[in-house]
């Protein structure tokens, strides 16, 4: 496939990455396929710069990221190892909290107001980020 | 100007199969996702699959799944609808269509007919 | 899936005359609706996105309001060309979903 040299349209370049900050909320699920959809991926937080960088555009809204454990571990969405990676949770975050009386309970993970990440339900209609990376040969599967 | 040319549309008995194509111009066919949507004569719009930019990421409606297929081939800037196993139902006009950044059509083509009858 | 439903299903209208079009959500899809206009044996054209902002082209009489589960198209002042079929879009969620349609004619 082809391969990536320059973001596209509307995104910002950071890092050999590209970044589109949605302004429009959707539930975890559905801005998972928003980004897969523009052949991307919620956003892999892997170094405090980047954390940074991500929170300095999406100011004090709640944002979702790539990260969650609806099927029992921590697992970002693009494979980066949860357990040695970068991590930067609100204190006593994550919780998986069941009192919010929507069911079940916490499995997505978003950016809090001040940046922090916390574990949250995953209908509720965040902002998002996507994120794909410069230089990456692209999906495109062969021709047959 | 962006122009989406379907063909590929004619009569097919009940279990056959057809290939519809879209040809597209006058934007940047590998940047955008594109979609198909029927309807059904004398009924409303019903959105059938997308197929992602690269062509790595698709979804289809549950009516669709598991017998049509989308792809795309960016060399020759056209989008393709592989259908197999026909149903009466499935019957409609397929307009294939860029899908936006915002989730919604912005240009169509004329559409191609497809009948399913025995 | 997301339903959507559309009032009235078909309106008859003149000329001048100010027309509103509801679209409903069966669950909240915050601002992500389009609006299109489908004359008979054409393609839709996109009128409206984002539930309230004006596609590039289209004339300022069309308007979009409403957010979550309730939104209306509104057409001020209704021209010869604006007879047709209008339906609504949700692009919150897989599959995506239209109304049924609203249909103006002339009265």
């Known amino acids: 496939g082809s391969e990536r040299t320059c973001c596209p349209v509307n995104w910002v370049e950071h890092e050999r990455s590209c970044y589109w900050f949605s302004r429009s909320g959707k539930a975890w699920a559905d801005a998972d396929n928003y980004c897969r959809l523009e052949d991307a991926h919620l956003v892999v937080v892997t170094s405090w710069e980047e954390q940074k960088f991500v929170q300095h555009h999406i100011g004090p809204v709640n944002t979702w990221m790539g990260l969650h454990d609806q099927n029992g571990p921590w697992k970002w969405v693009d494979g980066t190892d949860y357990e040695t990676g970068f991590k930067n949770w609100r204190p006593e975050q994550p919780d998986d909290w069941y009192g919010h009386g929507l069911g079940g309970g916490e499995d997505c993970a978003h950016f809090t107001d001040d940046g922090r990440w916390n574990d949250d339900v995953c209908q509720r209609p965040y902002r998002w980020v996507c994120e794909t990376e410069l230089d990456k040969a692209s999906q495109e599967p062969p021709l047959l | 100007e962006v122009q989406l040319l379907e063909s590929g549309g004619g009569l097919v008995q009940p279990g056959g199969s057809l290939r519809l194509s879209c040809a597209a111009s006058?934007?940047?066919?590998?940047?955008?996702?594109m979609s198909w949507v029927r309807q059904a004569p004398g009924k409303g719009l019903e959105w059938v699959s997308v197929?992602?930019?690269?062509?790595?990421?698709?979804f289809y409606a549950d009516s669709v799944k598991g017998r049509f297929t989308i792809s795309r081939d960016n060399s020759k800037t056209t989008l393709y609808l592989q259908m197999n196993s026909l149903r009466a139902e499935d019957t409609a006009v397929y307009y294939c269509?860029?899908?936006?950044?915002?989730?919604?059509?912005?240009?169509w083509g004329q559409g191609t007919l497809v009948t399913v009858s025995s | 899936d997301i339903q959507m439903t559309q009032s009235p299903s078909s309106v008859s209208a003149s000329v001048g005359d100010r027309v509103s079009i509801t679209c409903r959500a069966s669950q909240d899809i915050s601002n992500w609706l389009a609006w299109y206009q489908q004359k008979p044996g054409k393609a839709p054209k996109l009128l409206i996105y984002?539930?309230?902002s004006l596609q590039s082209g289209v004339p300022s009489r069309f308007s979009g309001s409403g957010s979550g589960t309730d939104f209306t198209l509104t057409i001020s002042s209704l021209q010869p060309e604006d007879f047709a079929t209008y339906s609504c879009?949700?692009?919150?969620?897989?599959?995506?979903?239209f109304g049924p349609g609203t249909k103006v004619d002339i009265k």
């Open positions: 984002a539930a309230s």
């Open positions: 879009q949700q692009g919150n969620s897989f599959p995506f979903t």
């Open positions: 269509a860029k899908r936006d950044w915002n989730d919604v059509f912005d240009y």
């Open positions: 197929i992602s930019g690269s062509g790595g990421s698709t």
């Open positions: 006058g934007f940047t066919f590998s940047s955008y996702a």
